[in-house]
């Protein structure tokens, strides 16, 4: 049977040969697993089976993707007479891809005899183990490199079967069974060598595509049995039709109309509905630096801006804690978002010994560097002698203020002897509630804030018995000259609430670097942004006038139509096959001759490096 | 993590008695999976003996009525009782567990002298 299109696809296990329940038990898991099943996604496990089970819901099994593993049975036969192609994604015992061990029973005559695997022809990665299963036969008769693609693939095969019937004439000595029907189907070990894979007959013109995995009825990758990579619609090939293509008339990669998915070894249209896209494979979670998010009705993953969001609950009213301390300080680990409050009490700072908390260690609260987003309110009321700013919550953008404290606070900061300035950076806005901020003796720059501009509604202060202002000016506590008159939160040019005149990264500058320095910028309203990494530094002038590879002034290596590039395309997949380009004596990139396939180094047939296709009598497609 | 540590190798005359242990941390070690294996120099490793989760035994041709398999679950212990010592058991013995992946010790010792 050739590759098909659709197939049963189900989860395979990780147990090993540690199972839970009875045989009967296990037979049930078997059957709910496997019924119908054609493509094991994971490892085939049977292990602790009866010997009355009747296994034949195995027999519809093409494929398994990791490996099978097959331990202290009883039944007689394993029929998984489909079986084309393990592949080992997964290994057992770190290189067994065939697993096979103690298939009997010590105290009757109940024992695996047959192991009919008589389509298995390919096992990707990984080798075989099968020992001591006292009356499995016709193990030694296999031809096992044949099958294994890795020659360096560890094989044991020994203590089985003793006493065996020969295998039947017509297998010559390969078998899996006493039986005509039983004979080994070789496909590698007896190619010509022109094959590097392989093969449906002896002939240097019989060899299987090199796509092929397990064999085939011809040399085409559609005359495949199974698939060494991907199956897309009966074709098997080495990637599944990517989501960029290089478009010739805007020298960029666009997305893709036709592009598929890898599930499995398949390429689909589109994922199962339990699964989400990551780049060009369906998955069934994102990665930990990915999110799902839906884009035009499609699920997929995306890389997070920094942190992945991660929201965790508070402290205070309705929360588990009364305060931070050292017994929950671990749990707001990588948050981003804190759905309640968060309270700073002395009980959870100096510890609680009626509670048997100890002290916090104060380098612990950096904890809160990844914080963004406080739904409910901020309360400090204590903090450690030697930190004399809340620069731990510079990255806090928002205090929602849905919960408040006492008498309507959502942010209240009082009696901090040791804090000489906030240090809230990132503070844009405090959706709710009254600012409470008072008795910090040493406490200055708060003056500065324009809370007005921080508050929905009109900002309802109480700020009071902190550092006077005139104390504050007399001492220099005052906002850096490059902050604008919004004010600031600290000292130096990265606590401003905004720029006099630039800003690069979050820190005031005088200028953007536009025409000297080691990195060149461009700048888009008020903000500095460095230009691309193709563009070359112009001496003197303008480098770059936008964020992208075609607003250089001039190129770093080549020029790909508008864009700089650092190299000219070279086998990048286009709307007809891989695309290959060189660059001229002008360092702009010019299409190679269409039957080139490996790249060139000019415009004609004779230019092609490695073997061109047969010349087709045709000029060059001017692109 | 799982952790498996051997010991009571050594050398024994001929005829003479081992008894191996194994001891277990980081599994569930009453329904685990376990086993003994062994490698002579210069040979291929073998399985000795194995005890399955539900307590099922089995032994290897060349030690079947000399070796002994045994488990203490209180102690998390595997145990290999080698009586009748020959020259040809000589070789370093391994511990696996088999929960989830398998997982080997690192083997103790056994010689067997003339």
């Known amino acids: 049977s050739e590759v098909g299109n659709s197939q049963a696809v189900c989860p395979g296990t990780l147990n090993g040969l540690s199972v839970t329940g009875d045989a009967e038990n296990q037979y049930q898991t078997l059957y709910k697993l496997y019924e119908r099943c054609e493509v094991v996604m994971g490892n085939l496990e049977i292990v602790l089976t009866g010997h009355n089970a009747d296994l034949s819901f195995l027999q519809w099994i093409r494929e398994v993707t990791g490996y099978v593993l097959v331990a202290m049975n009883e039944f007689s036969t394993l029929p998984l007479p489909n079986l084309r192609v393990v592949r080992g994604t997964q290994v057992y015992d770190g290189k067994f891809a065939i697993f096979v061990m103690l298939n009997y029973n010590t105290n009757s005559s109940h024992a695996l005899r047959q192991l009919r695997l008589t389509q298995l022809t390919e096992i990707l990665s990984g080798g075989v183990y099968i020992e001591k299963n006292d009356k499995l036969c016709h193990m030694d008769t296999i031809d096992w490199r044949d099958i294994v693609r890795d020659r360096d693939a560890e094989i044991v095969v020994k203590d089985n079967g003793r006493s065996c019937p020969p295998c039947h004439e017509v297998c010559k000595g390969r078998c899996w069974g006493p039986g005509s029907e039983d004979c080994q189907t070789l496909t590698k070990t007896i190619c010509a060598p022109q094959c590097n894979g392989r093969c449906f007959g002896r002939a240097p013109n019989e060899c299987c595509h090199e796509e092929c995995a397990g064999g085939c009825t011809g040399p085409l990758q559609t005359h495949c049995f199974a698939c060494r990579h991907f199956n897309d619609s009966g074709a098997c090939v080495p990637l599944c039709p990517q989501p960029l293509i290089y478009n010739k008339l805007t020298f960029q990669l666009e997305p893709n109309p036709d592009t598929k998915y890898q599930y499995g070894s398949v390429c689909v249209r589109s994922c199962p509905h339990n699964f989400v896209v990551d780049q060009s494979s369906c998955v069934r979670a994102c990665p930990s630096n990915k999110m799902e998010v839906e884009k035009n009705g499609l699920k997929m993953c995306e890389p997070c801006a920094g942190l992945c969001p991660k929201a965790c609950e508070g402290t205070g009213a309705g929360s588990h804690y009364q305060t931070v301390d050292s017994s929950n300080i671990d749990s707001f680990v990588n948050c981003t978002k804190i759905l309640g409050n968060l309270d700073f009490l002395i009980t959870g700072l100096e510890g609680d010994p009626w509670r048997n908390i100890s002290a916090l260690d104060p380098e612990k609260l950096n904890v809160f560097r990844t914080v963004r987003e406080i739904t409910g309110y901020l309360n400090i009321q204590s903090w450690p002698k030697h930190m004399h700013n809340f620069s731990v919550f510079s990255n806090l953008e928002t205090i929602g203020g849905r919960s408040l404290y006492n008498r309507g606070f959502s942010l209240l900061i009082m009696k901090n002897d040791n804090v000489t300035s906030l240090g809230l950076r990132s503070l844009r806005e405090v959706s709710a509630g009254r600012v409470y901020i008072t008795e910090n003796r040493r406490l200055c720059y708060l003056h500065t804030v324009q809370w007005a501009a921080l508050s929905r509604r009109r900002a309802d202060l109480d700020i009071r018995n902190n550092k006077p202002r005139g104390k504050c000016q007399q001492e220099g506590k005052v906002c850096d000259p490059l902050c604008s008159a919004d004010g600031c939160w600290g000292p130096g040019p990265a606590q401003c609430l905004s720029c006099r005149h630039y800003s690069r990264r979050g820190v005031c500058v005088e200028s953007c670097s536009f025409t000297q320095g080691e990195t060149r910028e461009f700048a888009e309203g008020t903000e500095c942004f460095e230009c691309h990494p193709e563009c070359e530094r112009v001496e003197g002038g303008i480098t770059c006038n936008g964020s992208g590879a075609d607003t250089c002034t001039r190129c770093a290596h080549y020029r790909d139509g508008p864009h700089c590039v650092e190299r000219c395309p070279e086998g990048i997949l286009g709307e007809r096959g891989p695309i290959y380009k060189y660059p001229d004596s002008s360092r702009e990139c010019r299409p190679c001759h269409e039957n080139c396939t490996r790249g060139c180094t000019g415009p004609l047939l004779q230019d092609c490096l490695g073997d061109a296709l047969p010349s087709a009598r045709r000029a060059p497609t001017v692109i | 993590e799982v952790q498996l540590v051997e010991s009571g190798g050594g050398l024994v005359q001929a005829g003479g008695s081992l008894r191996l242990s194994c001891a277990a941390s980081g599994l569930t070690f009453g329904s685990a999976p376990m086993g003994w294996y062994r490698q002579a120099p210069g040979k291929e490793r073998e399985l000795v003996a194995y005890?399955?989760?539900?307590?099922?035994?089995w032994y290897g041709d060349s030690v079947k009525g000399r070796f002994t398999i045994s488990r203490d679950t209180t102690k998390n212990t595997l145990y290999l009782q080698m009586n009748s010592l020959k020259p040809e058991d000589t070789a370093v013995y391994y511990c696996v567990s088999d929960v989830k992946v398998r997982h080997w010790g690192q083997g103790t010792q056994v010689t067997v002298s003339s």
């Open positions: 005890i399955s989760g539900d307590e099922r035994i």
